[in-house]
Interface confidence: medium
């Protein structure tokens, strides 16, 4: 349930037990469309998309990234390792998606939908990986303090953080999409 909402506002989902690859593919493409809309607002509002100072802000963030060892790339592809990485990465992105809430004016619904749709995607992938126990969930206390820290940044850093989260999340999802199509 999004922050500040009553659960009665949300139609509780009853998802089918089996989630096809096509459905997961569609869910990711749907989230990517949402990210595009959010990036459009971010880029229109500030010059962050052309900024060369990304490295300054990137040092503050520990955004999930795909690496060779994760087994998601064509070379050294490993279905199990990769699936664990995708789920773990999405779980780690959740705190950053929480940060994005209230960061948008004309795209408020898109920001909330990206967050909600990511939760659903995680559910789908967890079903697919039901026999994998190597998935670690981020510590809620650590997430809470990270969120507080991000929200306490100055305006320029907050804008840069928003831009970096969207860019990294887009790249992570695109890599995930390519990898999941191999599974």
């Amino acid at each position: 349930v999004p922050p500040g909402e009553d659960s009665k506002d949300v139609a509780a989902p009853h998802r089918q037990p089996l989630t096809s690859s096509e459905r997961i593919d569609k869910q990711i493409r749907y989230i990517l469309d949402g990210i595009s809309a959010l990036r459009k607002e971010t880029c229109n509002k500030s010059n962050m998309c052309e900024s060369s100072k990304e490295a300054l802000a990137e040092n503050n963030l520990n955004l999930p990234k795909m690496a060779e060892k994760d087994g998601c790339f064509q070379s050294g592809f490993n279905e199990e390792t990769c699936l664990v990485k995708i789920i773990t990465g999405l779980l780690e992105f959740e705190v950053y998606l929480e940060y994005l809430q209230n960061r948008f004016e004309s795209s408020e619904e898109q920001a909330r939908a990206v967050q909600m749709s990511t939760k659903v995607l995680i559910q789908f992938l967890q079903k697919k990986a039901k026999n994998l126990d190597a998935i670690t969930t981020p510590d809620p206390t650590t997430n809470a303090s990270l969120l507080t820290k991000l929200q306490a940044q100055n305006q320029w850093l907050q804008d840069m953080t928003t831009h970096l989260i969207l860019r990294s999340f887009k790249e992570f999802l695109q890599s995930s999409l390519r990898a999941l199509r191999q599974m």
Partner: antibody, heavy 122, light 108 residues
Framework: EVQLVESGGGLVQPGGSLRLSCAAS????????MSWVRQAPGKGLEWVSA????????SYADSVKGRFTISRDNAKNTLYLQMNSLKPEDTAVYYC???????????????WGQGTQVTVSS | QSALTQPSALSVTLGQTAKITCQGG??????AHWYQQKPGQAPVLVIY???SRPSGIPERFSGSSSGGRATLTISGAQAEDEGDYYC??????????FGGGTHLTVLG
Amino acid sequence: EVQLVESGGGLVQPGGSLRLSCAASGFTFSRNAMSWVRQAPGKGLEWVSAINSGGGSTSYADSVKGRFTISRDNAKNTLYLQMNSLKPEDTAVYYCAKEGYTGWKDPMYDYWGQGTQVTVSS
Amino acid sequence: QSALTQPSALSVTLGQTAKITCQGGSLGSRYAHWYQQKPGQAPVLVIYDDDSRPSGIPERFSGSSSGGRATLTISGAQAEDEGDYYCQSADTSEHIVFGGGTHLTVLG
């Protein structure tokens, strides 16, 4: 309990105007996009117009563009549809509908009002 | 003409399975939602996001989507399931579109 109650319908002559209202309760109105959907007698559902949660973004079906205006007053938890230059083909039951959370591009309507009848006839 | 195509009518024997289809090019990348409408009443959401059921909707209602076709399945149709069913999605210009509706008759 979520409730949507439409009012303002009635009989109007072609070329006339009407303003529909939809009073919302039981949910955080200011955080939900809303739509108007109509249904002509014996026909299917037709989307008319939508407005985002803050009221800054609106969209309209081609059949009503330039004649109808959707608006909202979040302080009063009320959605409006101002209908001008009405035509006989606008005759329908007009429903106010709350958009669910899971979509922004493909919104679904998880709650509907009971509808208000608009008849355009001379 | 609707951008989403549904059969105008369908009959099913009590207790049997009814499958209502909804066809449209946009359904390959957009979600389909389904509504049930009984005479003189407002529509009720029965399936959203292709295959998800809101709370309070019986388990006999399920949904699926593949390519450009969405399907609403009612397994073990009951007399109270008789009514009109509409699929809904969005077109490329972000406008909401409804299918023309399917009248389901449950033969008892």
